[in-house]
Interface confidence: low
């Protein structure tokens, strides 16, 4: 409770009557300060501490020559010591001091908890000059107080290089309990104990805590804040909150959902983005994670072929990104693909299966019986070969790629030619004379280029030296290709 009293502001000396003294001092200028007319300051007194002896700093003033008065020590007058009020109320408090007029440039500053209050604070200083002294009243007002306004406020005055400090005024803002720690949402394992924490502060203290589960109180008797609730285990989702009570009333925390971890839902929307002869790039949309992070996923692949043994290939991959390139697949084959993901509880069911196909592969064998010879005009090299026996998976033959490398002293260059699938011979122009020409041939399908045949070399002589003997690939079992010149 606070007593408020209003009284007329009458400037008065600290000690009435003349005092002996012999110190001489120049006293020519009076303190010239504005006077705010009609201002009736509100003075606050604490009834619990009437006439409390002053314990603050004092300044010893000098002696005036006029009348040879020795001035007593300066000190702030006692004022209200402790103000208790509710949040959002307005408060005003002040400190006052009477200063002999010999002193100039006196300023009063306000401090809170050891820090000066600067800037946009509502502080007003009013001056009431009289013949010998000026009464100074410094008021500080706060509109709609908050908890952050709690603290110890003092006035300071600097005079003659001395600092005069007032008694502290303690402001205590009381309100509903304020949460400093609220329960947090959690994902827990079924039938496993866990803790929830709730902490709230006043003032006023004490703050008592009640726990609420699914709208029903858990504890009959309140616990002093902070409170830890140990839940022995849950079998289904629950919502918990805590109530904080003090003399001002009740505050309820946010409700938090405690989820029970479960296996994930199966992935959905398995999509195929890219298909090659031996790989398929898939993506999927993860299912619900069952309140527990995904650990990894499993891509299951079955070959859709009446002749296959029905075995399932399993590829384990990380849960993110939701993409996987399935490799080591057969070319031109049909596959059924499903995805399953796991968390700490277990594996999800498999996604809906989708069908996908690999494309044609490249040939796996090179053309056979490659023969190379210089024709009669010696302007061309004639190349012949036999079509390779390609597997169905390699797809339809679209042509051949011929590599011919020309090497002589200081020269080496490779050229590539492409011919259609119906060809089994080709002619290439002689590029360099007195050089070796090395020929290799590969079959090409839409799936790519197959392996090149073993190299066949032929020597191209200088002009005027004729030889028609062919070079050819070796018969099966021979170690090196034959070179016939």
């Amino acid at each position: 409770a606070i007593t408020e009293a209003r009284e007329e502001a009458k400037p008065y000396p600290l000690f009435p009557g003349p005092l002996p003294g012999s110190l001489q001092t120049d006293h020519t200028s009076l303190l010239s300060l504005p006077h705010t007319s009609g201002y009736q300051p509100a003075l606050m007194f604490s009834p619990t501490q009437p006439g409390r002896p002053y314990t603050g700093n004092v300044a010893i003033p000098r002696v005036t020559s006029a009348g040879s008065k020795l001035l007593p020590p300066l000190a702030f007058k006692h004022t209200v010591g402790h103000i208790i009020l509710s949040e959002h109320k307005d408060v005003k408090f002040n400190c006052s001091i009477s200063v002999p007029n010999i002193y100039q440039d006196t300023t009063i500053s306000w401090w809170k908890d050891g820090k000066e209050l600067l800037g946009a604070h509502h502080a007003i200083t009013q001056f009431y000059p009289d013949d010998e002294v000026t009464a100074i009243i410094a008021s500080f007002s706060i509109t709609s107080v908050q908890r952050s306004d709690n603290g110890s406020y003092i006035c300071k005055m600097k005079i003659n290089n001395e600092e005069i400090v007032s008694d502290p005024i303690y402001i205590e803002v009381q309100g509903l309990p304020h949460f400093t720690k609220q329960p947090e949402s959690m994902n827990v394992t079924r039938n496993t104990a866990f803790n929830l924490t709730c902490q709230a502060v006043g003032p006023p203290e004490p703050v008592n805590i009640f726990w609420v589960q699914n709208s029903s109180r858990v504890n009959e008797q309140p616990e002093k804040s902070p409170s830890v609730l140990t839940v022995p285990g849950l079998t289904e989702m629950a919502v918990f909150s805590c109530e904080a009570h003090n003399d001002k009333g009740l505050t309820v925390s946010k409700g938090v959902q405690i989820n029970i971890k479960a296996i994930p839902s199966p992935p959905t929307e398995v999509s195929i983005h890219n298909s090659t002869a031996h790989s398929i790039l898939i993506s999927w949309v993860p299912g619900f994670d069952g309140y527990s992070p995904f650990r990894n996923c499993s891509v299951q692949v079955k070959e859709v072929d009446p002749l296959s043994n029905g075995s399932v290939m399993i590829f384990n991959t990380s849960a993110s990104p939701h993409m996987y390139q399935i490799k080591q697949l057969q070319a031109l084959a049909n596959y059924s693909i499903g995805v399953s993901c796991m968390n700490e509880i277990g594996w999800s069911a498999v996604s809906p299966w989708i069908l996908a196909s690999t494309t044609e592969g490249a040939p796996s064998v090179a053309p056979l019986n490659v023969t190379v010879f210089l024709n009669e005009s010696r302007d061309n090299v004639d190349i012949r070969w036999m079509k390779p026996l390609t597997k169905r998976q390699a797809g339809e033959l679209v042509g051949y790629r011929i590599s011919h490398v020309w090497q002589s002293a200081g020269i080496s260059k490779e050229l590539l030619e492409e011919v259609g699938q119906n060809n089994s011979r080709a002619q290439i122009s002689v590029q360099v004379h007195n050089a070796t020409c090395t020929v290799r041939i590969a079959a090409v399908t839409k799936g790519g280029v197959g392996p090149f045949s073993d190299p066949v070399k032929i020597f191209i002589p200088a002009h005027g030296w004729v030889d028609h003997a062919p070079s050819s690939t070796p018969a099966p079992g021979n170690a090196d290709p034959v070179l016939i010149i």
Partner: antibody
Framework: EVQLQQSGPELVKPGASVKISCKTS????????MHWVKQSHGKSLEWLGG????????SYNQRFQGRATLTVDKSSSTAYMELRSLTSDDSAVYYC??????????????????WGQGTTLTVSS | DVVMTQSSLTLSVTIGQPASISCKSS???????????LNWLLQRPGQSPKRLIY???KLDSGVPDRFTGSGSGTDFTLKISRVEAEDLGVYYC?????????FGGGTKLEIK
């Protein structure tokens, strides 16, 4: 001569679906991928998705995944684009455009060498 | 997604004069296969887009040789040596290197 002939303009209500067709001629339908591109009024172009009729593989721009479905009818060499749960933001001109002679929709390439004439979709109540 | 930026929204040119349209990408369009899949389209008023250039500088069949494409990495340019009336329309650059394929905002070529 390569030609892509699209179906006519559509006026549909919000929340409904639409299916636009693109009939091709002048080339082997299964040897090229087919793509769909959206052009909002006075705005730029946005790739919606692509379809490989050779191995029946689709690939979508993530912005349209789940709402767009691309299909083909190989017998008539026709591509289709269905868009569901329409809103006014879907009002635009939609083009079909031919892709590369490629076996992957995700491989880099020089797509979009031939374009349909465009189908205007208006979504309004 | 790769962002394609065409800084000029409109380009006013005189018939017979040269024109230059720029296009920047938010990341390099050089693919691991050594190719740069940067392409240019022209959309004439009231028509469908038409491909002009692919692989930065290769002209589509039937495209006049007054068109040239150049650039590498992230900066590309389409040049017209002498603008003709049939060249008017909106020019779009687009990239086919990084999935999903993305287009520039377009540059409108108009007569001064």
């Amino acid at each position: 001569e390569v030609q892509l002939q699209q179906s006519g303009p559509e006026l549909v209500k919000p929340g409904a679906s639409v299916k636009i067709s693109c009939k091709t001629s002048g080339y082997t339908f299964t040897e090229y991928t087919m793509h769909w591109v959206k052009q909002s009024h006075g705005k730029s172009l946005e790739w919606l998705g692509g379809f490989n009729p050779n191995n029946v593989i689709t690939s979508y721009n993530q912005r349209f995944q789940g709402r767009a479905t691309l299909t083909v009818d190989k017998s008539s060499s026709t591509a289709y684009m269905e868009l569901r749960s329409l809103t006014s933001d879907d009002s635009a001109v939609y083009y079909c455009t031919r892709g590369d002679l490629l076996w992957s929709l995700l491989l880099p390439g020089n797509y979009f060498d031939y374009w349909g004439q465009g189908t205007t979709l208006t979504v309004s109540s | 997604d790769v962002v394609m930026t065409q800084s000029s929204l409109t380009l006013s040119v005189t018939i017979g004069q040269p024109a230059s349209i720029s296009c920047k990408s938010s990341q390099s369009l050089l693919d691991s296969d050594g190719k740069t899949y940067l392409n240019w389209l022209l959309q004439r008023p009231g028509q469908s887009p038409k491909r002009l250039i692919y692989l930065v500088s290769k002209l589509d069949s039937g495209v006049p040789d007054r068109f040239t494409g150049s650039g590498s990495g992230t900066d590309f340019t389409l040049k017209i040596s002498r603008v003709e009336a049939e060249d008017l329309g909106v020019y779009y650059c687009w990239q086919g290197t990084h999935f999903p394929w993305t287009f520039g905002g377009g540059t409108k070529l108009e007569i001064k």
